[in-house]
């Protein structure tokens, strides 16, 4: 899915209002310094691509995130604010339901959610291209020049 046409500010508002709190709940009891953020993203569409991948794609050692509250709210936000997103996810959702019945929190999952928090932080606060600035890597999306 190409996230270029999403309403980034609405997704940001959804994250700050609810999703972030669910991520905090999931990470409760974990020190903020326990995991080193290594996953990064260059612009808002890229950040959403990485967020989708880490949230919904099963990985070695962590196959259960998609059933979590933050994941369901993430999916809802993307479905509402990214045109055509829902249609692309139907097959993926059916496969997900077949793959898992229970939620298991592993250290690998905690590390993955820590990476997610870093991606969301970057999504919310990209450094903006300034008028007359020539030092900025101009690889960003069309929503990226007016507001955070």
């Amino acid at each position: 899915y190409d996230f270029t046409n999403c309403d980034f500010e609405k997704i940001k508002a959804a994250y700050l209002s609810t999703i972030s709190k669910d991520l905090i709940t999931y990470m409760s009891g974990t020190k903020s310094t326990e995991f080193n953020n290594t996953v990064s993203c260059s612009n808002r569409p890229h950040c959403l691509t990485e967020i989708q991948s880490l949230t919904f794609n099963p990985t070695a050692g962590c196959a259960s995130l998609a059933k979590e509250m933050f994941a369901m709210k993430t999916k809802a936000a993307l479905a509402i604010w990214c045109p055509g997103y829902s249609e692309t996810q139907i097959n993926a959702t059916q496969a997900m339901k077949k793959a898992r019945k229970s939620k298991v929190t592993t250290n690998k999952c905690l590390e993955q959610v820590s990476q997610l928090q870093g991606l969301w932080r970057r999504f919310n606060r990209p450094l903006l291209k300034q008028q007359g600035s020539s030092d900025y890597k101009d690889d960003d999306d069309k929503h990226h020049h007016h507001h955070h």
Partner: antibody, heavy 120, light 111 residues
């Protein structure tokens, strides 16, 4: 607990440059925007610019655009602010500050400040 | 650039009384229903300390006598019952539009 430790006070001549460092410890460095804010004696706070250490992307206040360079070294978790063509009105305390965990856009961790005095 | 104008420039309030500081933005700092205005307290010789984020949310470890309100262009920081340790300069800051800007500051003293 995250801490930002800045380099020591500097006395500089007009026309010269100054480079202030800000070393982060106790947390992740590369995925937080790091900002520089200055405060002239008895004056308010003035934002100078910021860097995302993850890829070195920067954003500057146009007021300082031609004189300030912000860089970061991920290997040492250190951010730098260099200000060139110094003039007497650049005499100020220079702070580095880290943005919050969630992308709200506030500064939750500050360095102790570095006093830069520009005098002939 | 968004200009933030604080009022008053200085304020003297008796211990235990209410203190109110206003911050007006030259244009709205709201986005998608959220107000990206923050408040800081700065004491002499110290860096600023976050008090309120996103207009009305209390920062970590901040006493609940501090509160924030407002949206759009008009925001208020209130201290419900002034304590001696609240003597400081208070700044508003907007993050909705680059460049990030601060208000000029309000000096709060005890009457």
């Amino acid at each position: 607990e995250v801490q930002l430790v800045q380099s020591g006070a500097e006395v500089k001549k007009p026309g010269s440059s100054v480079k202030v460092s800000c070393k982060a410890s106790g947390g992740t460095f590369s995925t937080y925007n790091m900002h520089w804010v200055r405060q002239a004696p008895g004056q308010g706070l003035e934002w100078m610019g910021a860097i995302y250490p993850g890829n070195g992307e920067t954003s500057y206040n146009q007021k300082f655009k031609d004189r300030v360079t912000i860089t970061a070294d991920k290997s040492t978790s250190t951010a730098y602010m260099e200000l060139s063509s110094l003039r007497s009105e650049d005499t100020a305390v220079y702070y580095c500050a880290r943005e919050d965990d969630y992308g709200e856009g506030y500064f939750d961790v500050w360095g102790q400040g570095t006093t830069v005095t520009v005098s002939s | 650039d968004i200009v933030l104008t604080q009022s008053p420039d200085s304020l003297a309030v008796s211990l235990g009384e209410r203190a109110t500081i206003n911050c007006r933005a030259s244009e709205s700092v709201d986005n998608s229903g959220l107000s990206f205005m923050h408040w800081y307290q700065q004491k002499p010789g110290q860096p600023p300390k976050l008090l309120i984020y996103r207009a009305s949310n209390l920062g970590s470890g901040v006493p609940d006598r501090f509160s924030g309100s407002g949206s759009g262009t008009d925001f208020t920081l209130t201290i419900s019952s002034l304590q001696a340790e609240d003597v400081a300069v208070y700044y508003c800051q907007q993050i909705n539009t680059d460049p990030l800007t601060f208000g000029q500051g309000t000096k709060l003293e005890i009457k």
